[in-house]
């Protein structure tokens, strides 16, 4: 029986050009984590395997860094990075657990403040 739960950072926002850490945590189970896949809308970002270590997809190599831990760091964020991200935990003997994070990439604070204090 699968007793574990995935805790994620939930809905998060970050500034364009900045970086963000995507983090999931599997709790309430003694199952062994054999692999974690990080995906973005039907696209593989990275895999962390207990035996093989990290694999970062070639198209994301310049902007994705492994860690901390089983998490993933996204760098040089663009507005196109806005969307859903999934952590898929492959465990033994439980099976697969999936967590979801929604990232919104915002224009920089300077642009925001400029708009906020405009005289109507």
């Amino acid at each position: 029986m699968m007793t574990g739960t995935i805790e994620t950072t939930g809905n998060i926002s970050a500034e364009k050009g900045g970086s963000i850490i995507l983090q999931c945590h599997l709790s309430s189970t003694t199952a062994q984590v054999t692999q974690v896949n990080w995906e973005q809308q039907d696209q593989l970002l990275a895999i962390c395997n207990a035996d093989l270590g990290w694999h970062i997809s070639p198209s994301f190599k310049d902007r994705v860094a492994p860690g901390p831990g089983l998490g993933l760091t996204l760098q040089s964020l663009t507005v196109n990075d806005t969307g859903e991200y999934f952590c898929i935990y492959h465990t033994y003997p439980d099976g697969t657990y999936t967590g979801r994070i929604f990232l919104e990439v915002l224009e920089s604070s300077v642009a925001e403040h400029g708009a906020r204090f405009q005289i109507p």
């Epitope: 696209q43 035996d51 492959h90």
Partner: antibody, heavy 118, light 107 residues
């Protein structure tokens, strides 16, 4: 350099048995999932069986379930396929393959031919 | 089982041509789609994995795209050594299944 070298193929009568071996070198064998894939003469590729690295879990195609057994000996860096109750339709070149992260096959052996005929 | 349908089953092309091969899955397989090249009497060789990632050492004229059920392998400028048979394969679930293959021949 990654190398996968199959052996054990040959001519066998219907109902007979064979054991294929795949000697792996050039990488940490125990860290990788491994598979057997076959190809009948003039036909396409057909997955036969897989075995995971950390758990030893095994998976089989319906066409071979109950007749074939995949196993590994990490101390010998060797993958095996025990084939029993062989049928004419099992005639094929059998490839040993490495499966990193369980998602793709990045290295294949040169293949060993199994012919089932009376 | 997930069925993989490749088209065309064969095609004739000339050196320098742009070649496109398609693969359709009978259900969504996300990005779990790989492409292999096989030459007569040889083992298959990995070209593209996870739908769009180019395997190390493979020329950049090969590219892959798609997600869900529809995928494409493109050879931007066909070279003499590219005449071979190409297979797609899904690794979303067992049984792992391959497409029927596309034979690329010289026109």
């Amino acid at each position: 350099e990654v190398q996968l070298l199959e052996s054990g193929g040959g001519l066998v009568q219907p109902g007979g048995s064979l054991r294929l071996s795949c000697a792996a070198s050039g990488f940490t064998f125990s860290s990788y999932a491994m598979s057997w894939v076959r190809q009948a003469p003039g036909k396409g590729l057909e997955w036969v069986a897989s075995i995971k690295s950390s758990t030893g879990y095994t998976y089989y195609a319906d066409s071979v379930k109950g007749r074939f057994t995949i196993s590994r000996d990490n101390s010998k860096n060797t993958l095996y396929l025990q084939m029993n109750s062989l049928r004419a339709e099992d005639t094929a070149v059998y490839y040993c393959a490495r499966v990193p992260y369980g998602v793709w096959i990045d290295y294949w052996g040169q293949g060993t031919l199994v012919t089932v005929s009376s | 089982d997930i069925q993989m349908t490749q088209s065309p089953s064969s095609l004739s092309a000339s050196v320098g041509d742009r070649v496109t091969i398609t693969c359709r899955a009978s259900q969504s397989i996300s990005y779990y789609l790989n492409w292999y090249q096989q030459k007569p009497g040889k083992a298959p060789k990995l070209l593209i994995y996870a739908a769009s990632s180019l395997q190390s050492g493979v020329p950049s004229r090969f590219s892959g795209s798609g997600s869900g059920t529809d995928f494409t392998l493109t050879i931007s400028s066909l070279q003499p050594e590219d005449f071979a048979t190409y297979y797609c394969q899904q690794s979303y679930s067992t049984p792992l299944t391959f497409g029927g293959g596309t034979k690329v021949e010289i026109k």
